[in-house]
């Protein structure tokens, strides 16, 4: 059979009816719905919202919807025994703490279970001792710190600004520099925006909110304690010492008015230049220590939370293919939140929530896809990514046989300015095209195309006329899918200016002040944005799913190989007498990417003009597209990072929500110049050559004629 | 008691090299950066450089990059300026001095050299 | 880099009076500017670092306020001991730090 005649609707009145069923005012009865009371992972109250999902999801047309439960390792505060921070004097008593919760916003008073503001994951302790202020902890300020400056963090208690990196890096880049404890602030530099009022008045970060997150360096593996295979009924589980990427020392989070108390008395070294000052009037001193009149009084904290094994619960929904049932396409967004979850992640679970009613609205009217669509409604994002690595490590040989395509859907918004996209190069034509499809919801733009309002106000910084559309890192739930398994990913949102807004994510991020409230009032009163978002994610979605041939396109891959390959020749260019000493080249991996893009092209043709209407070539043509994505996996995985197995992209090994392309060159290269053995430092970039010139050639041959 | 005792005067001829030192007691001379001064005659300080004694790291202003070397001797606490080839305009006080911190004011001073140059 | 201003070149105040000098930066550097009194024939001294905080053993008619581009030293009641060369300096930049061309302060 056609896709026409296994769906009864022409392709072209199949995506209108879909994208006109979506509906704005649905999506705000949902966000209202699901942003009432908190669903914190492991507890009751998100157990029964899955159970609410699955329920809506079924009357909503889905063939089938399940619960997956799996018990993962998450981390609560000791309810009686609160985490807080203290200024101590020499006699050891506290003459300062900071706050042990956030003031509720107006209307949520009497709410219970609002679990105060903790790093998840950290160790119990009560270590005191100096502080030393750390800029935003990332790489290059430890540098700065320790190598440069001389300033010793060994022993010290750090703190240090969130923003710029995942809290995750910070920690361990402490740990690394042998810091006793972490102490992570918002810095009004970086969550308070110019000129716009602090919640409830306005959707800044107010003195007392903190962000709340997990700390763990997971490296994809998912649960602690069951890396590689899923937490079900008969896992073996790791002892809490072999436990995978669990920080090792005390680490808590505080709001800014908090930090203003600590910074306020730092002595010490003046901050290296004016890149560490934040916008407290304080003087960002780094220390160590206080200064002369405070000198004896040192920092201690007290962390109590506790590790537990709990029962964690996703969503899975299947509409079935008509034509091709063993072909998924996946849309995925977590359900858990920290508190509300007014933007993180209910804002987009209920743009998934809408997408999935329209999808059973065509279905109870006779339509199907041509392929099966998949919905999940992940837990336990927010621990570590662990619902959906758990889901996908259960699933993985499916998966990998059959997975065509994965679009997350987490927070819809995190501003209200113009599209943001993050993708595989397969599917930079889908979301071009798609977007010249649907209208701009953005004031001056009237009339206009998503596409040309996107354009204008984010444009590529390569080719003219053309929206950026970044890498995919990572720190959502696309991680396992892209990463680990090679499924060809992308996700879409609404974002801010990023050239006039410095701050990192939205300010409320992760703070009981992510309300239903903060998006009703501020960021997207009518909703249009989170439709339009709907209509991005929808829609790729329902092309994946119900094209005749696949909508991804391999000539864009090779461009940005070339691109890619470009960059990392010339950082290691940076070093010409080593490359030249030992005898380091490039050429295997140009020679590469040169085949790759002319198969990429002679497949193209060939795909332009084969007979569509033989199943078997088809399905045959597809299915080289699908694996494509798949080519680029290498089973041995990066160095030290087993389930990051994707040769051209992997998370960064300094900030985990950053892409870096080449991430094994790139990695065998970074700092270099300091490494004991430069023979073996530069063994290991040949190595990682290697490795990359090998998977593109390889992945080139999955393109080429099969006979 | 924290001091810095320079070395004693020089007089010296254009094209002719120079090694001065700065020696530091009642500290802990490795772990506080040296920095050097010059004032020329009747005029204002210039930073000229600093010197980490712990591990001989050493920052140059831009003005004074190639023109001198600041080295350390950490078993002898002891820090130099030296010149391969000075100048009649070198003439001036030299002054080490202890930055109190990495990123910091300088809190001890060394009494000065005198270096004068003239053929 | 930053330049330092410092003004008033000369400054005269006779004793007991008060001496205001002032320094101003082409950046802002926070808080990070020190104070130092020279007197003819010897080395610098700190007086004020962090813009405001005394060194042990400075008398306390010495003060220092500003921050940003803005800084003043202020000696409150002048003693003849206080005749001097006063510059300031930022350690904003590091490893870069630069001074002021200097403020000469004369007792009538």
């Known amino acids: 059979k056609s896709s026409n005649e296994a769906t009864n609707i022409t392709p072209k009145h199949n995506m209108k009816a879909f994208l006109d069923e979506l509906k704005a005012e649905n999506i705000k009865k949902f966000l209202y719905n699901f942003t009432q009371i908190p669903h914190l992972a492991g507890t009751e109250q998100n157990f029964q919202l899955a159970k609410q999902i699955q329920s809506q999801w079924k009357e909503f047309g889905l063939d089938s919807v399940e619960l997956a439960h799996y018990d993962v390792l998450l981390s609560y505060p000791n309810k009686t025994h609160p985490n807080y921070i203290s200024i101590i004097n020499e006699d050891g008593n506290e003459i300062f703490n900071t706050s042990l919760f956030e003031p509720p916003p107006p209307g949520y008073e009497n709410v219970s279970d609002i679990v105060p503001p903790f790093s998840a994951f950290s160790p119990q302790g009560m270590p005191e001792g100096d502080l030393v202020y750390v800029n935003y902890a990332r790489t290059e300020d430890f540098f700065k710190l320790e190598r440069d400056m001389k300033i010793n963090c060994s022993g010290k208690i750090v703190i240090a600004r969130y923003g710029k990196v995942f809290r995750g890096n910070k920690v361990k880049n402490a740990q690394l520099a042998g810091a006793k404890g972490v102490i992570l602030y918002s810095d009004p530099a970086d969550y308070f925006a110019p000129g716009v009022k602090s919640y409830p008045d306005g959707w800044n970060l107010p003195g007392g909110g903190v962000q709340r997150g997990n700390i763990l360096n997971l490296n994809g593996a998912g649960d602690p304690l069951t890396p590689g295979y899923p937490a079900n009924e008969y896992a073996y589980r790791r002892g809490i010492a072999e436990a995978v990427g669990l920080p090792s020392i005390p680490v808590h989070p505080i709001g800014y008015y908090d930090a203003q108390k600590l910074l306020e008395k730092m002595g010490g070294s003046a901050p290296p230049d004016s890149s560490w000052r934040g916008s407290l009037k304080v003087p960002y001193n780094v220390g160590p220590g206080f200064t002369g009149n405070f000198s004896t009084q040192k920092v201690k904290m007290h962390i109590h939370s506790t590790n537990e094994v709990t029962r964690i619960y996703n969503v899975i929904g299947t509409l079935r293919g008509a034509v091709e049932p063993d072909r998924y396409v996946i849309l995925g967004g977590h359900r858990d939140s920290w508190v509300f979850g007014g933007i993180d992640p209910q804002s987009g679970a209920a743009v998934v929530h809408e997408i999935v009613r329209s999808f059973g609205t065509l279905k109870k009217e006779g339509w199907r896809p041509r392929r099966t669509i998949l919905f999940a409604s992940w837990d336990a994002e927010e621990f570590g990514l662990l619902g959906s690595t758990e889901w996908a490590e259960e699933n993985s040989r499916l998966l990998q046989e059959r997975g065509v395509a994965y679009i997350n859907a987490d927070s819809s918004i995190e501003g209200n300015y113009t599209l943001r996209v993050d993708c595989t190069p397969l599917m930079y034509s889908l979301v071009h095209n798609l977007t010249k499809e649907l209208k701009s919801p953005d004031e001056g733009f009237e009339g206009k195309s998503l596409y040309e309002s996107w354009t204008k106000k984010s444009p590529s910084p390569e080719f003219s006329g053309m929206p950026r559309i970044s890498k995919l890192g990572s720190g959502n739930d696309f991680e396992v899918f892209f990463q680990r398994l090679g499924i060809a990913s992308g996700r879409a949102r609404y974002t801010k200016n990023w050239e006039t807004n410095k701050f990192s994510g939205y300010p409320l991020y992760h703070s009981v002040y992510e309300t239903y409230e903060l998006v009703e009032k501020f960021y997207d009163p009518m909703f249009k944005y989170h439709l339009t978002v709907a209509q991005v994610r929808g829609g790729m979605v329902f092309e994946l799913a119900n094209s005749i041939v696949l909508p991804f396109d391999c000539r864009d891959y090779a461009v940005v190989l070339r691109k890619y390959a470009d960059k990392i020749y010339s950082i290691s260019m940076k070093h010409p007498q080593e490359m030249k000493t030992y005898s380091v080249s490039f050429d295997s991996l140009f020679s590469a990417v040169k085949n790759f893009t002319e198969i990429a092209s002679k497949f193209s043709e060939r795909l332009q003009d084969f007979d569509k209407s033989n199943p078997i070539v088809l399905r045959m043509m597809n299915d080289q597209l699908m694996f494509l994505e798949r080519a680029f996996i290498d089973p041995l995985g990066l160095p030290d990072r087993p389930f990051y197995r994707h040769v051209i992209y992997a998370p960064s090994s300094h900030n985990k929500y950053a892409g870096e392309s080449f991430p094994g060159i790139y990695d065998a290269l970074f700092d270099i110049e300091s490494k004991v053995d430069p023979s073996k430092a530069w063994g290991e970039v040949k190595r990682q050559i290697y490795v990359a010139a090998f998977t593109v050639q390889a992945a080139a041959e999955t393109l080429s004629e099969v006979a | 008691e924290v001091q810095l005792v320079q070395s004693g005067a020089e007089v010296k001829k254009p094209g002719e090299s120079l090694k001065i030192s700065c020696k530091g007691s009642?500290?802990?001379?490795?772990?506080?950066?040296i920095g050097w001064v010059r004032q020329m005659p009747g005029k204002g300080l210039e930073w000229m450089g600093i010197?980490?004694?712990?591990?001989?790291?050493?920052r140059y202003s831009p003005s004074f990059q190639g023109q001198v070397t600041i080295s350390a001797d950490k078993s002898i606490s002891t820090a130099y300026l030296q010149w391969s080839s000075l100048k009649a305009s070198d003439t001036a006080m030299y002054y080490c001095?202890?930055?109190?911190?990495?990123?910091?004011?300088?809190?001890?001073w060394g009494q000065g050299t005198l270096v004068t140059v003239s053929s | 880099g930053i330049v330092m201003t410092q003004s008033p070149a000369t400054l005269s105040v006779s004793p007991g009076e008060r001496a205001t000098l002032s320094c101003r930066t082409s950046?802002?550097?926070?808080?990070?500017l020190a104070w130092y009194q020279q007197k003819p024939g010897q080395a610098p001294r700190l007086l004020i670092y962090?813009?405001?905080s005394r060194t042990t053993g400075i008398p306390a008619r010495f003060s220092g306020s500003g921050s940003g581009t803005e800084f003043t030293l202020t000696i409150s009641s002048l003693q003849s001991e206080d005749s001097a060369v006063y510059y300031c300096?930022?350690?904003?930049?590091?490893?870069?730090?630069?001074f002021g061309q200097g403020t000469e302060l004369e007792i009538k």
């Open positions: 001095a202890r930055r109190m911190a990495a990123a910091g004011p300088f809190d001890y």
């Open positions: 009642g500290y802990s001379f490795t772990s506080y950066w």
């Open positions: 010197i980490y004694p712990g591990d001989s790291d050493t």
């Open positions: 950046q802002s550097i926070g808080w990070n």
């Open positions: 962090g813009a405001s």
């Open positions: 300096q930022h350690y904003d930049n590091w490893p870069m730090c630069s």
